[in-house]
Every structure is written in structure tokens, then in C-alpha cells.
Interface confidence: low
Amino acid sequence: TQHGIRLPLRSGLGGAPLGLRLPRETDEEPEEPGRRGSFVEMVDNLRGKSGQGYYVEMTVGSPPQTLNILVDTGSSNFAVGAAPHPFLHRYYQRQLSSTYRDLRKGVYVPYTQGKWEGELGTDLVSIPHGPNVTVRANIAAITESDKFFINGSNWEGILGLAYAEIARPDDSLEPFFDSLVKQTHVPNLFSLQLCGAGFPLNQSEVLASVGGSMIIGGIDHSLYTGSLWYTPIRREWYYEVIIVRVEINGQDLKMDCKEYNYDKSIVDSGTTNLRLPKKVFEAAVKSIKAASSTEKFPDGFWLGEQLVCWQAGTTPWNIFPVISLYLMGEVTNQSFRITILPQQYLRPVEDVATSQDDCYKFAISQSSTGTVMGAVIMEGFYVVFDRARKRIGFAVSACHVHDEFRTAAVEGPFVTLDMEDCGYNIPQTDESTLMT
């Protein structure tokens, strides 16, 4: 996961929407108790914005200490600030908790930019606007960090919702959601609706604004329109999925689909941008530039370094193309596509010098670690992390930003052959050979 701010090919047979209709798997299937319906107490329990992350209120310790915690599907540690830091309004004070248990083990987590380190322990944890349960969970008490906490973000810790395989220091450290499911009757599933504002928020507006919802243990029908379409979780480490085709304004990028998933494709709420492998990024930018060629933008804009501004209310959304990612479906040879608008991939930012203008950063960037479907993608959709069935669902979010001409979309099915070949197999070190 990265904050503001996350490593021989065959020619593809496919991805073309041939028009053949296949039976689809959506949410129109037998209901299970607790999995579907209304979760009023959890709706609107997130705050924040895509550039600084979305956070949920949690309590740790006895008596409970309230903290705001970044929701991160791209990591697997529950880690909270546990020492004074200039960017933290509050922090976890272990000495004040009668239920804290020290594991006497350190943890060090480096990111591409930044790092944190801390001390492992367990304590009682609950989510006030979540299921009415308390669990004993692993907590990394962050004692030192560098470029991790964000000034003004209003969160004091991170909730890693991915799988144990990527937990630090190793996969023996049970992630929070695993503990929650093991210790309670909460179903093994959560869903996220991240609501981009569509305009820059100042500090007071962030504190007052609704950022979205994390529904723990179920799906709330009020948060999406249309149908949910599911893609398999390829491997339980990150939330890894397979992209089988990419289109810019309906034009196929025509790349070997392995390139789209080199070396993986993940869904990561803790990353701001849509991050694409180098070759894919270059092809996508070339295509987006061509589509929006009625206006010229500096190179720094396409690199995500420079803002572009328009007079308030005059952003020419129509000159920017829609982007479609086709994801492997649950049925053999079936895919579906998710389509985002420039309202998702142009991120509104405050420009103090021109506060009467609407300014944006290009929120698609280059990655050396595969495709990362970050907040700018997720803000278009209601995303269901159905861990029990090893799949991720997408539906059009009821809160996504759009205009009168275009809307984000989730559509299918499409016939796509040989989708398994789109997955990249990361070379595994054969550890047994190292033992000899």
C-alpha cells in the first residue's frame, strides 16, 4: 500500500465483447442470514478523502480509547500510533489499558516511501459504528515512523484488511478481520463504499463530511445501483484479481493481457491512484492524451506532479475518456467490465493561489509492482470483499461523482477466452533448495 500517498508472453485471444449472453452471477442468489439487507448502524461510518485515505472510528483497550483508523485493503496489520507525533491528535496509550498484553516482539514495516515500526501486543478492539462485538486482536503499537502519518488526515492508525500471508513480521500474526470472524458470528465478508467529494475539501469540511461506508459482515443494498458482478480472488494475500482487457473510450489497448497483471493486480483502498505497470501506463496515457487532445497539458500533469485548473464549474469533463477494466468473471470464459469517468481519475485538489478555480491532479500513475486499483477506482463502485467465497464484487456506487452525460458502469457478461493466461505467476523461491 502506498499513501499520496504501492512490483515469455502470449498474444491475447481476447477480451472482445462478442455480444454472446451468458448466465451472470450477481447478488440474485439465495440469501444468507446476516449477509444481506440493511446495516443502518454502519452506513456513513467512514470519513476522509481519496488523497489522504478513508478512516473508521475504532476503540482499543480498557477503558476504551477512541482512534480514527485508516481502512486499508492493501495490507494486513492493525497498527496504531502509540507515541506522540506532531501529526497525531491522539494516540494509543498502552499503559492506560488494563487489557493490553505485550507480545515482546518488534515489527518494522517499510513502504516505498516511508516506514513505521512498533511493538506487538494484543488488546480488546471494537468498532462503534460496526458490529456490536469486541475482539482481542493483534495491535502493532507504532513507536517510530517516517512519512507514514499524514498531516491533517485525522487518522491515527491503519486497519490492514488483507490476508495473513502479507502480515508483518510474518504470516503467523493473525490479521484483525480473521480475529473478528473467529471470535464472533460476523460473516467473513465486508464491503466498502468510498465516496469521492468531487471537489477539494478543507480541514473543517473533511471533519464534517461523510466519506462512505464500511459494512462489516454484509452487503447494504442502499449503497449501490444495478447488479453486483463478482471476480475471483486469485490468491489470498493481497486482494488479487485478474484484469483481462483495458479500454480507453471503448478502444482496446490491445496489449497482452499478462501485461495488465504484471506482476499482480490488487484492490487497495489504502492507495490513492489507479496505478498501472509501466508499459500499460504508457499505453494508457498515450491513449488518454489522444482522446483529450483538444486541450494540451504539460508533461508534469500526466506524471501526477502538476495541477491543471479551470475556472470554477467549467471543467471540460467531456474531453476526457472513460476507462474500462474488464475483470475475470466467475463463470468460465465470462468477464465483466467496470468503467470509470474522469470524475474519478482526475483528483480534485486545493490550489491556494487560485482558490476560485477547480484544480485537479491526474490520479493514474506508474507502478513497478503491478496494477493497483486504488481509491480513484473504488470511488466509482460499491466493492464487496467476499472472503468466504473468495471473490470481489463490484456495483455502481450510489455516491459516485458523475455528470448528466456519463455515469460509472458495471456491465456484463462478455465472452473472454483463456483468461487464466492473463495472470502472472510470480517466481517463487524454492526454499527447500536453500536448505541443502
Partner: antibody
């Protein structure tokens, strides 16, 4: 008390290499970065780079890549900077400094090593 | 690289006065700025980090302020021992860079 003790002054010939040392005491050596800074009269302070002894992670100023190499010996709590292919431009005072992992500023400095390169 | 400009190479003040030393960054560095004091023949000493936080043991007459591109180190009630050169540093992005220094002279 945090202390960074640097090696003594050196007089070197152009083309030679030199290894400067910085011994840390009074804190956990592996929990902080060691910064290296160059100071020449009229040139102010220049950041050369840093090493994190806990993981031997390094960051170099592009300008000094190929010129400076950082190492650290955690058994003796000593950081080293090797300067290669010396020229008169390398004549300066070199400082090591400690930097907290969570702030990046140089909170404690060594006394400096004066390097003179002359034929 | 980010350039830090300290517009005054020298500043002259009297004991008991208040003096402000400025530092301007060529681009936004947030609050990732530190100030150092270097007395003649000595190594630099940390005064301020994160633009406004005093380093341990630094007298409260030293105050840092600013964010983005404009930063100020203010010394109120200047003492004779404050005769030194003062440097700003940004650590928002690599390579970290320093200002050219401002030498404070006591009248």
C-alpha cells in the same frame, strides 16, 4: 548522552580513497538514521545521504553517487563513509549526524572530520 | 532539487532584540523544515524540526513558523551566545537540501 565521535583529520592525495568513521554512543544505533553532510567555505551545507544501520538501507544524493559509499557495523555501533577518486573539490569538513526514524532532521551531530586533498 | 533561499547572508542585532531569519523553498515542502545553529568552529546543532517544534533543550526564545514555501526562525530576547550562523533544511523530499545560511552578528 547521545554522542557521535568522528575520526580525525585526513590529508589525502588526489585519486586516493578515504574512509571516515562515526562511532555512536548513548542510544540504540540500529533505531536511527545516520546522515552525512559536507561543508565547504562558501558552499554551505550539502546533504550527501543517509544509512539506516538497522536494515542497512541507504539513500544517496545523486550528486554523490559513485563518490560516497555508506556502511555500518552494528557490532561496534560505527557508521562509515568511503570517498573515492578524491579531488581538491572533496576538501571539506564532513559531518555525521543522527536522524530519528520518524522525523528525518539531524538531531545530534558529530564534531566533524576535516579532509584535505592536496598533491 | 528543492532550493532553499535565505535572503539575508548577514543580520545584525542587539542583545535583547527580536530578530527573524527567513527561508524560502522553491516548492512546497509542507512542514518538513528544520533549523540549525552553527557557532564558529563548532558543528551544527538542531534548534527546530517540523517547522515549529523545538528540539530538546532549546531555549523557548527560539521559535519556528511557516509551512509550504515560507519559513521563519524568530529569536526573541537575543543573547550574546546566539552569535552564530543559522541554516534551514528541508526533508520533504530527496535529496535533502540546506539554505545558504544567515550569519547573526551582535552589535
Amino acid at each position: 548522552e547521545v554522542q557521535l565521535q568522528q575520526s580525525g583529520a585526513d590529508l589525502m592525495k588526489p585519486g586516493a580513497s578515504v574512509k571516515l568513521s562515526c562511532k555512536a554512543t548513548g542510544y540504540t544505533f540500529t533505531g536511527y538514521w545516520i546522515e552525512w553532510v559536507k561543508q565547504r567555505p562558501g558552499h554551505g551545507l550539502e546533504w550527501i545521504g543517509e544509512i539506516f544501520p538497522g536494515s542497512v538501507s541507504t539513500n544517496y544524493n545523486e550528486k554523490f553517487k559513485g563518490k560516497a559509499t555508506f556502511t555500518a557495523d552494528t557490532s561496534s555501533n560505527t557508521a562509515y563513509m568511503q570517498l573515492s577518486s578524491l579531488t581538491t573539490e572533496d576538501s571539506a569538513i564532513y559531518y555525521c549526524a543522527r536522524s530519528p526514524i520518524y522525523y528525518d532532521y539531524a538531531d545530534y551531530w558529530g564534531q566533524g572530520t576535516t579532509l584535505t586533498v592536496s598533491s | 532539487d528543492i532550493v532553499l533561499s535565505q535572503s539575508h547572508k548577514f543580520m545584525s542585532t542587539s542583545v535583547g532584540d527580536r530578530v527573524s531569519i527567513t527561508c524560502k523553498a522553491s516548492q512546497d515542502v509542507g512542514t518538513a523544515v528544520a533549523w540549525y545553529q552553527q557557532k564558529p568552529g563548532q558543528s551544527p546543532k538542531a534548534l527546530i524540526y517540523l517547522a515549529s517544534n523545538r528540539h530538546t533543550g532549546v531555549p523557548d526564545r527560539f521559535t519556528g513558523s511557516g509551512s509550504g514555501t515560507d519559513f521563519t526562525l524568530t529569536i526573541s530576547n537575543v543573547q550574546s551566545e546566539d552569535l552564530a550562523e543559522y541554516f534551514c533544511q528541508q526533508y520533504n523530499s530527496y535529496p535533502y537540501t540546506f539554505g545558504g545560511g544567515t550569519r547573526l552578528e551582535i552589535k
